[in-house]
């Protein structure tokens, strides 16, 4: 018996088609993805094949103005239109708190939303009961398939799930649910979740009874053969893990941003064992037409976005210096504003030991593309911020050794004076350079803001200590020559859309007046 699994993950509000790098579509003939194009391909496969499931492995939320404006209603509406069969909760589904998940998505979705390792307690338990499930048994043809969900246990550090949701270890939580499915005579079981490729592989290895793992969170691109676009495969599709009980378990993920549709064909025997698995992600390029009715619906929803982008978010009473002449040479107040917003966006998980889990921000000066003049009545709009941060990136959380940070700051000024983009703007960091010294030895002082303290203060960076840092995904991926970050990072979790972070901060503060205050000397 053959099952076709179609899957997406980390779509991050890319409801409209995008350019090849998943930013705003400029030349429509070269654009990719989007729900209208996805629907065309899904329908084509549904018509051609008998047993098809369409699954999403989480992080539909967060990433473009669509989410900023519609706050998840767009996710429910278009996933319903595409007739998804199931979705796992990702960490970003909690970005607007539990209410921001319950009302727009959990109550509106016509498909099951799953996570076995999230347990509600206190007053939330009754409120959220039945709105998400640990597993769901889906009829497919004359067979049944069990889908069991999971979510990154790091979610409390990455999003805003509040205090009434407990995120358990994925493997510990999944095993009893899979065992329960087995007692219900469900012998074909898919683990669908959002914890990253390493955890996906562990689930395949350790959870007895899981036949297939469909994952997300790490934006992993897997491919067998010659890849069709720019993404470099992290392994073959499917990636085969040998389980502890001797089975071959296929693990898949489909990159991110709706650029690909994962396509996996699984052959099950009478006992529910995987006899064979093969497939590849399908690149959703312009050779696949956009479905006209979904496209018309997108255009209808689009109107509200255009109105939103010119509305005032807040005011500045100072010039926001985002010029390259400043931000690529010295501390600039636009850099300070953005870094302060980045830290503010990550204020969570305080306890009696830590005032916050992260205190540091770095930001390449070259990523700041425009100033904002205060003489326009001080008004700041989304449109203004889109000029400052036009690349549609995210502000991510990484863990780095102090020695890696030191290398990054040396790289920041290794060719100082040429107006290059790698000059770092900072938050929660005091750095002193001596430009008379030779490149690679110019950082003479590097102090960082403590987190394990009740009164934050600056202490010298320790080379062997592990630090959390918020930075643009561009830097986490080694951009602007920061190869040491990419090569040496110990953990990387994707964060919120850059413009959204700054816009939320400005809306919260109402009036801003960032200064140049001696962070960089």
């Amino acid at each position: 018996w053959e099952l076709t699994i179609l899957h997406t993950n980390d779509v991050h509000s890319r409801l409209e088609q995008t350019s090849e790098d998943s930013s705003k579509c400029v030349n429509a003939s070269r654009c990719m993805g989007g729900v209208a194009r996805l629907f065309t391909k899904v329908q084509q496969i549904r018509r051609a094949e008998p047993n098809v499931l369409l699954l999403d492995a989480g992080d539909q939320y967060q990433g473009t103005i669509w989410f900023t404006v519609y706050k998840g209603a767009e996710v429910a509406h278009f996933m319903n239109a595409l007739r998804y069969d199931a979705m796992a909760l990702g960490n970003h589904e909690f970005d607007n708190g539990v209410e921001g998940l319950i009302e727009p998505l959990l109550k509106e979705a016509k498909f099951p939303i799953l996570s076995a390792n999230i347990k509600a307690k206190g007053p939330l338990a009754s409120q959220i009961s039945g709105l998400y499930l640990p597993y769901k048994v889906l009829p497919v043809g004359d067979e049944v398939v069990g889908i069991v969900g999971y979510t990154s246990k790091e979610t409390p550090f990455l999003s805003n799930p509040g205090t009434n949701l407990v995120f358990e270890d994925e493997i510990t939580a999944l095993q009893p649910e899979v065992d329960k499915l087995k007692t219900l005579n469900v012998n074909k079981i898919i683990a669908l979740g959002h914890s990253g490729f390493e955890t996906d592989k562990l689930i395949a290895q350790k959870v007895r009874g899981v036949d297939v793992v469909v994952g997300g969170h790490s934006n992993t691109f897997l491919y067998t053969g010659n890849p069709p676009s720019k993404e470099v495969p992290a392994g073959k599709y499917p990636f085969i893990v040998t389980s502890d009980d001797g089975r071959k378990v296929p693990v898949v993920q489909a990159y991110a941003f709706g650029k690909y549709l994962g396509y996996l064909k699984i052959e099950f025997d009478e006992r529910g064992n995987v006899i064979s698995s093969h497939g590849n992600p399908i690149l959703l390029n312009s050779s696949i037409p956009e479905d006209p009715s979904i496209k018309a619906d997108i255009n209808k929803w689009r109107i509200k976005l255009d109105n939103y982008s010119t509305q005032e978010l807040g005011k500045t009473i100072v010039y926001l210096d985002g010029s390259s002449q400043s931000c690529r040479f010295r501390e600039c107040n636009m850099g300070n504003l953005i870094c302060d917003a980045m830290i503010n966006n990550n204020l969570r998980h305080a306890d009696e030991m830590f005032w916050n889990h992260v205190s540091m921000c770095i930001l390449n000066g070259g990523g700041i593309r425009s100033p904002i003049d205060e003489r326009n009545n001080g008004t700041i709009t989304w449109e203004n911020l889109a000029a400052v941060l036009p690349f549609g990136g995210t502000f991510d959380l990484v863990q780095l050794k102090g020695s890696t940070l030191k290398k990054a700051f040396e790289h920041s000024v290794h060719r100082y004076g040429q107006s290059t983009g790698e000059f770092l703007q900072v938050g929660g960091i005091h750095v002193v350079y001596d430009l008379s010294r030779k490149p690679g030895d110019r950082v003479v002082k590097l102090d960082v803001l403590c987190t394990k303290c009740r009164v934050p203060s600056y202490d010298p960076l320790k080379m062997d200590e592990i630090y959390k840092v918020i930075l643009p995904n561009f830097l986490a991926n080694g951009g602007d020559g920061f190869q040491m970050i990419k090569d040496e990072l110990l953990r990387h979790d994707s964060g919120d859309q850059d413009i959204n972070v700054v816009s939320t901060y400005i809306s919260k503060m109402k009036v801003i007046y960032p200064a140049v205050e001696g962070r960089i000397k």
């Epitope: 018996w1 043809g141 004359d142 067979e143 005579n185 040998t242 071959k248 025997d269 009478e270 006992r271 064992n273 995987v274 006899i275 064979s276």
Partner: antibody, heavy 113, light 106 residues
Framework: EVTLKQSGPGLVKPTETLTLTCTVS????????IQWVRQPPGKGLEWLGV???????DYNAAFISRLTISKDTSKSQVVLTMTNMDPVDTATYYC???????WGQGTLVTVSS | DIQMTQSPSSLSASVGDRVTITCRAS??????LNWLQQKPGGAIKRLIY???SLDSGVPKRFSGSGSGTEYTLTISSLQPEDFATYYC????????FGGGTKVEIK
């Protein structure tokens, strides 16, 4: 639990027709096929034929003229019919799942007058 | 038809021995190979499917490997209950079996 239960006669006279039934539980005949295999005493396994989930059948060329495999999906039963039995057809007959994950208990069929 | 050549046809071994049985297909069968165990009573049980995946409840001393036309069943440390006849079965086309390997006590 996935099981196959065979039923049918243990003794058949030469020239007569053998009819064996395989009753399936734990999976559906609309999703999976059933294979038939035999094993003469002291010898190896020999494939006879298969009925697929869609209802079509394939047969070993050596038996195509006298072998029929049919099914009643609603009763979860598959029937093997072999005509013109001969003493050389004496063997243990097995039904098995399409992928060999499950086997019937086997029926020793002796062809003798 | 795809022919399966299994060797050896029989072997004598002691408890604790490592035993290897091979099957060669007449053409590429793309990992679509099972290993079956038949005890003297006649009951047939699948041990390994898709070349190398272990069936539920089968001890880890059994392992399968191979690709293309060459396939191997290995018993890492023979136990008393392992004395039986073993068959390879290809399902890339109409089923065909290897001739069997009888594993006897030395």
């Amino acid at each position: 639990e996935v099981t196959l239960k065979q039923s049918g006669p243990g003794l058949v006279k030469p020239t007569e027709t053998l009819t064996l039934t395989c009753t399936v539980s734990g999976f559906s005949l609309s999703s999976y096929g059933i294979q038939w295999v035999r094993q003469p005493p002291g010898k190896g396994l020999e494939w006879l034929g298969v009925i697929w989930s869609g209802g079509s059948a394939d047969y070993n060329a050596a038996f195509i003229s006298r072998l029929t495999i049919s099914k009643d999906t609603s009763k979860s039963q598959v029937v093997l019919t072999m005509t013109n039995m001969d003493p050389v057809d004496t063997a243990t007959y097995y039904c098995a799942g399409q992928y060999g994950s499950v086997w019937g208990q086997g029926t020793l069929v002796t062809v003798s007058s | 038809d795809i022919q399966m050549t299994q060797s050896p046809s029989s072997l004598s071994a002691s408890v604790g021995d490592r035993v290897t049985i091979t099957c060669r297909a007449s053409q590429d069968i793309g990992d679509r190979l099972n290993w079956l165990q038949q005890k003297p009573g006649g009951a047939i049980k699948r041990l390994i499917y898709a070349t190398s995946s272990l069936d539920s409840g089968v001890p880890k001393r059994f392992s399968g490997s191979g690709s293309g036309t060459e396939y191997t069943l290995t018993i890492s440390s023979l136990q008393p209950e392992d004395f039986a006849t073993y068959y390879c079965l290809q399902y890339a086309g109409s089923w065909t079996f290897g001739g069997g390997t009888k594993v006897e006590i030395k």
